[in-house]
Interface confidence: low
């Protein structure tokens, strides 16, 4: 049953002599592995013995015997699926049919396969998109219908006989449905290859030439120009003649209408391929191009800058920048339209000619207060001298120039008094609009730039003002030279250093802080006594009389102030002790009788001793020896010491007499 | 007074896009724009350039296939559109003019009027 044979594999195959054919093929036996399989070249099947009759390329039996031809070709197949074929080398003669005869167990089958084999290397084909257009890129196809793995080959462009930069890409099919070569090339082509001649060429692994396909180029672009210009520099004054000549160099395809641009712009009635102009005014100055048409669209040729010169028109002048600060720096800028540019400038400063300025710019590295002003220019260039246009101002603002403090009263201020300042400067740009004050205070200010200090203090030393306007400038501070009575007056002890004894040598000082006028008297006092007119107060020997309550007063123009009150105390051993008795000097016996020890001390006396007539101290340590009852033999002369931290005092003796009482005289 | 003035720049990350623009004021004539840049502590080097006659661009080869230069005549103004942007590109950007014809378009004496240029700066 013969359906049941399926084969896959190209219709024809090409090779040319001593190359090698590839014939990739499939097949299914559906009734079993394949048993035998032989190989015609132009097989004829003869009836009478029911065989085929022809060349036996390759035969494989179940004995295995294999013929000579097999070393060329094999059989690359298997038992069931694969019946791919390889001829390497392939002959002319080789041309034809191959019968591919396959036996199974029960079937059999004879399959054709069509060989075309040439006496040279057929060349490639170049297959070309039906329209190409400058810049637009293509794909340039080389296709060539053989592929062998035996017989390596590539294919090369060429561009009018030299190798393209571009990179092909080169594919290989060899399948059961096709067999060929293809490269493929990216391309991009300008106006300038039109009518260039490309070639594919087919090499063998060794770059040796095997065979080629050329095609010329037919590329499409917009007209190419050339514009030529008289004369050829394109400058010229007012009232030459120019002529501009267009020339299309290439076109693909011809030309159909021709036109002439000015900026950008279409110029009227004017489509020949010549352009004159007549007689040009400095408008006519501008880019100048021809545009030519074809189908594929328009071209436009280079474009030619004419300059039509003329001499400089009025100038203006552009200052970089004002208001200008002080010290900053200053550009001015002459503008003047002219062609060619001018060569030489000439600057005026509110009308005064500039020495040595000739440049369209200035620079002044440093401004100053009398640079503003209207500054204007002229130009020249070789064809005249512009006119001077209306000039532009400068402005040069600065700080408060030369600012003062003037204090407005009479002098001398004296402390509590008013005083008013003001603040004065010479000149300002733009105007003071507000006035600054050091040290700060609550200060009235009655009017811009006035100060009013009530009650100043005797410490207002100085006071400095600033006149601001974008800035501040101060004044150097001002002295107010306040006068005030002295101050901070007190008394101080000089001598000794440490506490006063009774005849010691002691110096007392009346101090102050500070005083304006410095020029002061001097006045002590002991309640309200004056006791001298110096700074100091001196003794010579302190007695405990001079302790008292001490003032001193110190005077200047402006007025007195006195210290606080200094106590002087003055320390002294006992002194002027007596021994008073109570209730008198004569005591009956009996009764009671008190001695105390009076005295003068300081400090006062920390310690008694009493002494009897024999100068026998006595058990008693107080102030007061009481006798009770006190008897005759008490009479007797007594006398007391005190003691203090700086000595001991004795007293005189004082007598007491006891006398008996009447009830003693009576029992004698 | 012929002025160029630069606009566009700025921080962009790697691989970023930034569009620059030209625009040239007062009424002159020009044949060519161009942009060039200066990284610091480098000289300034041409980037792009566009002839108004016929379009034509030109580029460096840092830069082909990134930057696209562009234009419109008839406004005076040029465009530089940068794509796929790196870190090397940082620097000041150019736009400068060319008012008559002198030759070659990568050269900066070739450009009679410059702009004051814009940073551009590409940083992660």
């Known amino acids: 049953d013969s359906s049941k044979w399926v084969f896959e594999h190209p219709e024809t195959l090409y090779a040319w002599e001593g190359a090698c054919v590839w014939i990739p093929c499939t097949y299914r036996a559906l009734d079993g592995d394949l048993e035998s399989f032989i190989l015609f070249h132009n097989p004829e099947y003869n009836k009478n013995t029911s065989k085929f009759d022809g060349t036996r390329l390759y035969e494989s039996t179940k004995d295995g015997k294999v013929p000579s031809e097999q070393k060329r070709v094999q059989f690359l197949g298997d038992k069931n699926k694969n019946c791919t074929l390889s001829i390497h080398p392939v002959h002319l003669n080789d041309s034809g049919q191959l019968g591919l005869r396959m036996e199974s167990k029960t079937e059999k089958w004879m399959e054709r396969i069509h060989l075309n084999v040439s006496e040279r290397p057929f060349p490639p084909h170049i297959q070309l998109p039906p329209e190409i257009q400058e810049s637009q890129e293509v794909t340039l196809t080389c296709l060539l219908n053989f592929s062998c793995y035996g017989y390596p080959i590539q294919l090369q462009w060429l561009l009018e006989g030299v190798p393209m930069r571009q990179a092909a890409v080169t594919s290989t099919s060899l399948t059961i449905k096709s067999v060929f070569t293809r490269s493929e090339l990216k391309f991009s082509p300008q106006w300038s290859h039109h009518g260039k001649i490309v070639t594919c060429q087919l090499q063998d692994a060794d770059g040796k030439f095997l065979s080629n396909d050329t095609v010329q180029l037919n590329v499409k672009h917009t007209p190419k120009l050339e514009i030529k210009v008289t004369p050829s520099d394109a400058i010229v004054r007012e009232g030459d003649s120019v002529t501009m000549t267009c020339e299309v160099s290439s076109s693909n395809p011809e030309y159909t209408t021709v036109s002439w641009l000015k900026d950008g712009t279409s110029l009227k009635k004017q489509n020949t391929f010549t352009l004159n102009l007549r007689e040009v005014t400095k408008d006519q100055s501008g880019k100048y191009c021809c545009q030519v048409s074809n189908d594929v669209g328009p071209g436009r040729s280079e474009e030619v800058f004419l300059q039509v010169q003329y001499a400089p028109e009025p100038s203006t002048v552009q200052i970089l920048h004002s208001p200008a600060v002080e010290g900053s720096q200053v550009e001015f800028l002459c503008m003047s339209l002219a062609n060619p540019l001018p060569t030489n400038y000439t600057w005026y400063h509110n009308g005064k000619e500039m020495q040595g300025r000739t440049e369209e710019k200035v620079h002044i590295p440093k401004i100053l207060p009398w640079h503003a002003g209207t500054y204007s220019c002229v130009a020249e260039n070789i064809l005249g001298t512009g006119q001077r246009g209306p000039g532009a101002e400068l402005d040069v603002q600065y700080p408060p120039k030369k600012v003062t403090t003037v204090i407005q009263n009479p002098m001398p201020i004296r402390e509590g008094d008013t005083v008013t300042l003001s603040c004065n400067y010479n000149s300002s740009n733009p105007s003071v609009t507000r006035y600054e004050w050091k040290p700060h205070g609550a200060w009235e200010e009655p009017s811009l730039g006035v100060l009013k200090i009530q009650n100043v203090g005797w410490d207002n030393t100085t006071i400095a003002c600033a006149a601001c306007n974008s800035w501040c400038s101060w004044a150097s501070p001002v002295a107010l030279n306040v006068q005030y009575a002295p101050r901070d007056v007190r008394v101080r002890k000089i001598k000794p250093l440490s506490e006063i004894h009774s005849g010691n040598s002691v110096s007392l000082q009346c101090d102050f802080s500070s005083s304006h006028p410095k020029e002061v008297q001097f006045f002590w006092e002991k309640n309200g006594r004056l006791l001298g007119k110096e700074s100091q107060l001196n003794f010579d020997s302190i007695s405990p009389e001079d302790a008292g309550s001490y003032s001193c007063w110190v005077n200047n123009s402006i007025g007195q102030t006195a210290s606080k009150a200094w106590t002087l105390e003055v320390l002294y051993a006992p002194r002027r002790l007596r021994v008073s008795m109570s209730p008198g000097d004569q005591v009956m016996e009996g009764k009671s009788a008190t001695l105390t020890c009076e005295s003068d001390a300081n400090p006062p006396v920390s310690h008694y001793t009493w002494f009897d007539w024999n100068n026998q101290s006595l058990p008693y340590h107080s102030q007061k020896l009481r006798l009770e009852p006190v008897k005759v033999q008490h009479s007797g002369a007594y006398w007391c010491q005190g003691t203090n931290s700086v000595g001991k005092g004795r007293s005189p003796l004082s007598t007491l007499t006891v006398y008996y009482s009447p009830e003693t005289i009576g029992r004698r | 007074q012929v002025q160029l003035v630069e606009s566009g720049g700025g921080l962009v990350q790697p691989g970023g896009s930034l569009r620059l623009s030209c625009a040239a004021s007062?009424?002159?004539?020009?044949?060519?724009m161009g942009w060039f840049r200066q990284a610091p502590g480098k000289e300034r080097e041409f980037v792009a350039g566009?002839?108004?006659?016929?379009?034509?661009?030109y580029y460096a080869d840092s830069v082909k296939g990134r930057f696209t230069i562009s234009g419109d005549n008839a406004k005076n103004t040029t465009y530089l559109q940068m794509n796929s942007l790196k870190p090397e590109d940082t620097a000041v950007y150019y736009c400068a003019a060319q008012r008559y014809y002198r030759g070659s378009y990568n050269r900066q004496t070739n450009y009679d009027h410059w702009g004051q240029g814009t940073q551009v700066t590409v940083s992660s």
């Open positions: 007062g009424s002159w004539f020009n044949i060519a």
């Open positions: 566009i002839r108004w006659s016929d379009s034509k661009t």
